[in-house]
Structure formats: structure tokens, C-alpha cells
């Protein structure tokens, strides 16, 4: 699944190139992994900004496939309480360019961990 | 397109509940949460609560926590909110939204976005 | 409880600019997000505003928001009759873990 997911963003990055999306997103560039799943839970939340924004079919049928992909990878941990982790609203922002590569970044620590 | 069809309206008399629905089409239903809004006649926006269609997580305004109960079923990606003990004050137009919260700690970057179309429930003797 | 302060109402002419105030206490809206929705009559409210300033895909660039200190607006310019609704401020308490709506602005479109 998490494969999937890292397909799903680089089609979401290719489906950017051709619009301007001024937006910035709250990034977590360095993931504790700690505190991997909550940053996973900021970034899947950001991603639908993208989706908010663009207003174009074919990424807001990505970043859906993508979430549902990831949110069923969650489930098995996604209860879990991590303590001392920055809340989504902490994070750095950054431009889309940077947010989809630090989120391909995380979904390989899940892959390496899984 | 993403829609949000809200069951009719409904009469009911102090102190009984009411349920109402609000069937969601257009977009995966069970990787979103639901959030929940009234508005009494000629009255501002009141937020009731929140729940995830993914996880069944809920979170209540403290006004309704003893009231309210929100509830989702996947299998026909409809989610519903029963207030009980009713009073006349309760009379309102219910609305359901969209909301992009899967997980609690996404709730305080949300949003809510479509609404459902509206569904009056009147509290009468 | 936190309340957000909205004007009852605000009116302008076609093509003009008509500012909405939404004002909150010294330490809520600093560091939270004002979001504005869109209530024309005997319809549902629609997004407007995110995240103070951000517009969804599909909302004019007429209607733009912006915060400073304790207070944040919402602009509308270049009025059109169809603008005339109710404006609805909005921001998580995060204290609370709820979300809280202003009072509500009844915009008029004059003439």
C-alpha cells in the first residue's frame, strides 16, 4: 500500500507542474520516528489542500485514492498516542515542490519499517 | 461532483429525540469526517460536533455532549446526528458538512466543505 | 466560551468595496485561523475563506481575506448584487477543541 502511495505523489507532482498552486503546506522535513504518525496524519491533511485549490479532477481523484491507500495503512498503528510531537500547525511551511518530497521521505520510513 | 443529500423535515415534541441523515455521494466517504452545524431561525451558526466516517472518532461541542450522538455507516456512506431530550429551543435548520478530518488532530486545520442542503426540525408541544 | 464579533450588517453599491470585521480576545485569533462562509438566502453556507487569506478553486478573486492582531476582514470588491447573503467568521478553539462562529454579517447590495 505505501508503494502505492509514493505512485500517487509523483503523479500528483507531475499533475502540478502545469498549474500555479501558490500555496504552502505545513511540512515536517525531519521525522522523528516517533512521531511518524502524527506527522503522516499532518501531511495527509495538508495534501488535500492541493486538492482544494486546484479545482482539476484528476488531482483531487489522486489525493482521494491516495489518502484512502494511506489511511488503511494507518489503521493498524494509527491509534497510537505519540507524546512530544509537534502539532501540525508547528510545522515549517513550505512550497508544494518541498511538501511532496518530504512526504515521499516519510512514506519510506513506513515502507522500511513495515 | 461531491454532494451531501440531508434527510426531510421533521416536527417533534419537547423532550423526544430526532435522528437525522445525511447521505454522501460523489468522493470516498469512509476516508473523511462528517462535522455537524444548526442554525436556529434568524440565528447565527452553531457547531455540534464531528465525526470520522474512517475511524468512528467523535468530538462534541460541550453544549451537546450529553445530547448528542453522531454516528456513520460506510455501507451507504451515510452519517447521522440524533439530538436528544429535545426543547423548543433546539428548533433549527441541521446541516451536515464535509470535513478533510480523518484523525482528531487534524480537526484544528479543517474545514467544512460542501454542506448538506439543510434539514428543519421544529420542537412543538 | 470564545466569541467571535461580527456587525450585524454592511451594505455598499455595485462595484464598490465593502469590508466584514470579525474580532476576537487578545489570545485566540493570533494564533488560530479565521475561515469565512458564504450564505446567500434560503441556502447552505459555502466555503469562502481558508486559513485566513487562501481561496478554494472557484471563488472569485473579489473576495479576499486578511488578519491583523486580534482582528481579521473579509474584502469584497467590485460588489455584485448576487454577493448579498450572510458572512459567517469562523476559528477552532483549540482550548476547547471546538469550532466557533461569529454572529454573522448581513451584507446589502444597495440600488
Known amino acids: 500500500n505505501w508503494v502505492n502511495v509514493i505512485s500517487d505523489l509523483k503523479k500528483i507532482e507531475d499533475l502540478i507542474q502545469s498549474m500555479h498552486i501558490d500555496a504552502t503546506l505545513y511540512t515536517e522535513s525531519d521525522v522523528h520516528p516517533s512521531c511518524k504518525v502524527t506527522a503522516m496524519k499532518c501531511f495527509l491533511l495538508e495534501l488535500q489542500v492541493i486538492s482544494l485549490e486546484s479545482g482539476d479532477a484528476s488531482i483531487h481523484d489522486t489525493v482521494e485514492n491516495l489518502i484512502i491507500l494511506a489511511n488503511n495503512s494507518l489503521s493498524s498503528n494509527g491509534n497510537v498516542t505519540e507524546s512530544g510531537c509537534k502539532e501540525c500547525e508547528e510545522l515549517e511551511e513550505k512550497n508544494i515542490k518541498e511538501f511532496l518530497q518530504s512526504f515521499v521521505h516519510i512514506v519510506q520510513m513506513f515502507i522500511n519499517t513495515s | 461532483q461531491v454532494q451531501l443529500v440531508q434527510s426531510g423535515a421533521e416536527v417533534k415534541k419537547p423532550g423526544a429525540s430526532v435522528k437525522v441523515s445525511c447521505k454522501a455521494s460523489g468522493y470516498s466517504f469512509s476516508s473523511f469526517g462528517i462535522s455537524w452545524v444548526r442554525q436556529a431561525p434568524g440565528q447565527g451558526l452553531e457547531w455540534l460536533g464531528w465525526?470520522?466516517?474512517?475511524?468512528?472518532?467523535?468530538k462534541y461541542a460541550q453544549k451537546f455532549q450529553d445530547r448528542v450522538t453522531m454516528t456513520t455507516d460506510t455501507s451507504t456512506s451515510t452519517a447521522y446526528m440524533e439530538l436528544r431530550s429535545l426543547r423548543s429551543d433546539d428548533t433549527a435548520v441541521y446541516y451536515c458538512?464535509?470535513?478533510?478530518?480523518?484523525?482528531?488532530?487534524?480537526?484544528?486545520?479543517?474545514?467544512?466543505?460542501?454542506w448538506g442542503q439543510g434539514t428543519m426540525v421544529t420542537v412543538s408541544s | 466560551q470564545s466569541v467571535l464579533t461580527q456587525p450585524p450588517s454592511a451594505s455598499g453599491t455595485p462595484g464598490q468595496r465593502v469590508t466584514i470585521s470579525c474580532s476576537g480576545s487578545t489570545s485566540n485569533l493570533k494564533r488560530n485561523y479565521v475561515y469565512w462562509y458564504q450564505q446567500l438566502p434560503g441556502t447552505a453556507p459555502k466555503l469562502l475563506i481558508y486559513?485566513?487569506?487562501r481561496r478554494p478553486s472557484g471563488v472569485p478573486d473579489r473576495f479576499s481575506g486578511s488578519k491583523s492582531g486580534t482582528s481579521a476582514s473579509l474584502a469584497i470588491s467590485g460588489l455584485r448584487s448576487e454577493d448579498e447573503a450572510d458572512y459567517y467568521c469562523a476559528w477552532y478553539d483549540r482550548e476547547l477543541s471546538e469550532w466557533v462562529f461569529g454572529g454573522g454579517t448581513k451584507l446589502t447590495v444597495l440600488g
Open positions: 458538512a464535509r470535513d478533510p478530518a480523518a484523525w482528531p488532530l487534524q480537526q484544528s486545520l479543517a474545514w467544512f466543505d460542501p
Open positions: 465525526i470520522s466516517a474512517f475511524n468512528g472518532y467523535t
Open positions: 486559513r485566513d487569506r
